[in-house]
Interface confidence: medium
Amino acid sequence: TTSAEKNTCQLYIQTDHLFFKYYGTREAVIAQISSHVKAIDTIYQTTDFSGIRNISFMVKRIRINTTADEKDPTNPFRFPNIGVEKFLELNSEQNHDDYCLAYVFTDRDFDDGVLGLAWVGAPSGSSGGICEKSKLYSDGKKKSLNTGIITVQNYGSHVPPKVSHITFAHEVGHNFGSPHDSGTECTPGESKNLGQKENGNYIMYARATSGDKLNNNKFSLCSIRNISQVLEKKRNNCFVESGQPICGNGMVEQGEECDCGYSDQCKDECCFDANQPEGRKCKLKPGKQCSPSQGPCCTAQCAFKSKSEKCRDDSDCAREGICNGFTALCPASDPKPNFTDCNRHTQVCINGQCAGSICEKYGLEECTCASSDGKDDKELCHVCCMKKMDPSTCASTGSVQWSRHFSGRTITLQPGSPCNDFRGYCDVFMRCRLVDADGPLARLKKAIFSPELYENIAE
């Protein structure tokens, strides 16, 4: 018999009080963690890293900082105004030796369109990435560099789930040893060839992503080469065999009836916590119908919510979710009609998702008013449309060319939307701000590995 492969990276996910504030409840936060982990699990499992296959992820533990923890002096993430480098450093100052990777999710608007930051793994002599153990660094502090952070906010707007999932996959890609994509082979979205360009860039593209192009949730050959080398050397250090559910991670997995976390986190009257004996933990307490950990259609009194109760808000493209009275899960919402306007009239609904461009409503295709084409910089944050496969017709929605569709009304992109051919993001003043993708990590490396550049730390 062949021994089972070590192919699972166990995660510790923390969320700060701002992430909780945005999503509102522990259950909603756990659902977000779950959807992010499922998304990267799908991406990595379906990628062949030069013969290393079925790389998967499992949440080993979560910690949700609620608004009540905002003033808790033991909560390192309580500070309101901290930059992305400092935020990653706060995560790294904790000991994460028990995990393959440790992430913090937040809802902060970091400078310059930065959606995440992570330490980059390397096959040897590494300081950072998967399986890296806590040690002293030359800034005199002990750190775990198997870490990363992501935020769901950009220039005052919340990024769509598909973009946030790709951000997570991108940062984890750094941990797994991939730098940013470069060169024509690995940045097809920058190609002059329309056929190549339309598939977009890969996960490790340095700048912006819309998340809806064919390549956006795939790794490039450049990334695969780099990640394969790191997996070859590192995965035996901390990856585990996949299989058993983890009672205590707050997620109800196969074989568990419920999961309200460990005794210090479990606020649930319905479920035995993870510190209970083997036969009881992650099981419903006697006489209880359900646990809120199973889904939003279970009351704190451990009973299914009645048929008419709302469990999901109405959104641009889907009607509200209504409990059905016999399960804790919130049933799928009915989609609104295709081509309903969404995202403040910049997009349209397709199959219940705000996914298409407003251009599609009129049989057109969205294009980028990119400055390299001699366009006015002011148009970089306009929604621009073109006739299908004819870039020469690309013009702003406010142009005379499209006045019969838009009546001369300029539709502007939402703040945080990609602009200038994915080189940057629109800010709140509708300026396209270029992304300095490598700046924050370079600054943090200098602080940790060359602290003499940062005088007067203590004395």
Partner: nanobody, 111 residues
Framework: EVQLVESGGGLVQAGGSLRLSCARS????????MAWYRQAPGKTRDMVAA??????NYADSVKGRFTISRDNAKNTVYLHMNRLKPEDTGVYYC??????WGQGTQVTVSS
């Protein structure tokens, strides 16, 4: 020019103690981090102890056995090493931010 001079190394039996000293010549401004590093044979140079202001940090392998301290009047940083183990063998280097490395002092712990 500022220089660092380490001393106090030697051969000691497992369970024994040593005190390493690192004196700096010349005046240094803006000193923020003082640290001791160990380079075991065939290994990289790793920090074992550091002092920043009043706070100290130790590598897991030496916690509870080694103590870092400094004497500002004498421009010296010390490493008190107790309950020494054979795996503590190596060349010990002192590092003060903004200053080049010293020559190091050899510590050999025999079993």
């Amino acid at each position: 020019e500022v220089q660092l001079v380490e001393s106090g190394g030697g051969l000691v039996q497992a369970g024994g103690s040593l005190r390493l000293s690192c004196a700096r010549s010349g005046r240094i401004s803006n000193i923020n981090i003082m640290a001791w590093y160990r380079q075991a044979p065939g290994k990289t140079r790793d920090m074992v102890a550091a002092i920043i202001g009043d706070s100290t940090n130790y590598a897991d392998s030496v916690k509870g056995r080694f103590t870092i301290s400094r004497d500002n009047a004498k421009n010296t940083v010390y490493l008190h090493m107790n309950r020494l183990k054979p795996e503590d063998t190596g060349v010990y280097y002192c590092k003060i931010s903004g200053v080049d490395w010293g020559q190091g002092t050899q510590v050999t712990v025999s079993s």
